[in-house]
């Protein structure tokens, strides 16, 4: 059985204020069951962007269909981007579990703001 | 076994079209990403087109944008890339590739056809 | 762009590597062509991932923006290009290609 890997293909993507972000990942397997959450930063301190399974985050949409069956596709697109939403953001695979448990973080795409074209 | 078989390719003249297609078999050819690659004589590969799963997304090389459609019947297990506006530089060995969880990355090829352009 | 160097040689029965760097990839995979024209093989995907089919003498591994194909045992039959792939649209897609040469 091949290693589950989290697949974020860009090192980093550059977006004008005011557009739409589309932030890319992948997985490699469906198992073990659990959520993927995307976080800005790391460690202790890393903020919550997105939970594919709970909260409402109303900037951010998933490219594809979450209820469609085998998606690994775990793209996200968040709208509206100012500058204080640069940073690098990380998807990571947890297991299901009480608490979920982290098993696997993509490798991490830095987002940058461009000015709004005049 | 996965196979990808391309059509015929052939000669045409500067400005006509060309539509190829490549069959599918031994994969669930509905739940996978499909690309075009090509090779033009003497050169590397070249990424031309890729189509999503489900065919509502489509992606281009800026070489070929808005002069070829890629597109897909997936009750048919088939490929499609209508070719206009051809050009010398065209001139290829075009390659169906099937990509494997993330849409850059290829896991099995066709044989390839030639596209020929030339006056 | 992705870079790669235009040609390496090896010794039968010896190790080669192969690398390719740069652009905005985070991810790399790896393509054999026999001969110019004929249809490419798939030999890496996603760094580290070899197909079923292919041989464990090779092999990938990435570390920051590089990416390497190592063949250890190298066999007559590997004299080939050697493609490196990115994950990053923005990158093209392919390297121009390494000519591995069987010594």
């Known amino acids: 059985e091949e290693e589950l890997q989290v697949i974020q293909p860009e090192k980093s993507v550059s977006v004008a204020a005011g557009e739409s972000a589309t932030l890319n990942c992948t997985a490699t397997s469906l198992i073990p069951v659990g959520p993927i959450q995307w976080f800005r930063g790391v460690g202790p301190g890393r903020e919550l962007i997105y939970h594919q399974k709970e909260g409402h985050f109303p900037r951010v949409t998933p490219v594809s269909d979450p209820t469609k069956r085998n998606n690994m596709d775990f793209s996200i697109r968040i709208s509206n981007i100012t500058p204080a939403d640069a940073g690098t953001y990380y998807c990571v695979k947890f297991r299901k579990g009480s608490p979920d448990v982290e098993l696997k973080s993509g490798a991490g795409t830095e987002l940058s703001v461009r000015a709004k074209p005049s | 076994d996965v196979q990808l078989v391309e059509s015929e390719g052939g000669v045409v003249r500067p400005g006509e079209s060309l539509r190829l297609s490549c069959e599918a078999s031994?994969?669930?050819?509905?739940?996978?990403?499909m690309t075009w690659v090509r090779q033009a004589p003497g050169e590397g590969l070249e990424w031309v087109s890729t189509?999503?799963?489900?065919?509502?997304?489509?992606y281009y090389a800026d070489s070929v944008k808005g002069r070829f459609t890629i597109s897909r019947d997936n009750s048919k297990n088939s490929l499609y890339l209508q070719m206009n506006s051809l050009r010398a530089e065209d001139t290829a060995i075009y390659y169906c590739a099937k990509s494997w969880i993330w849409w850059t990355f290829f896991d099995y090829w066709g044989l390839g056809t030639l596209v020929t352009v030339s006056s | 762009a992705l870079t790669q160097p235009a040609s390496v040689s090896a010794n039968l029965g010896g190790t080669v590597e192969i690398t390719c760097s740069g652009g905005n990839s985070n991810h790399y995979g790896w393509y054999q062509q026999k001969s110019p024209g004929s249809a490419p093989v798939t030999l890496i995907y996603a760094d580290t991932n070899r197909p079923s089919n292919i041989p464990s003498r090779f092999s990938g591994s990435t570390s920051g923006s590089t990416s390497t194909l190592t063949i250890t045992g190298v066999q007559a039959e590997d004299e080939a290009v050697y493609y490196c792939g990115g994950s990053s649209t923005g990158d093209g897609i392919f390297g121009a290609g390494t000519t591995l040469t069987v010594l």
């Open positions: 031994g994969f669930t050819f509905r739940n996978s990403y």
């Open positions: 189509i999503s799963d489900t065919g509502d997304t489509a």
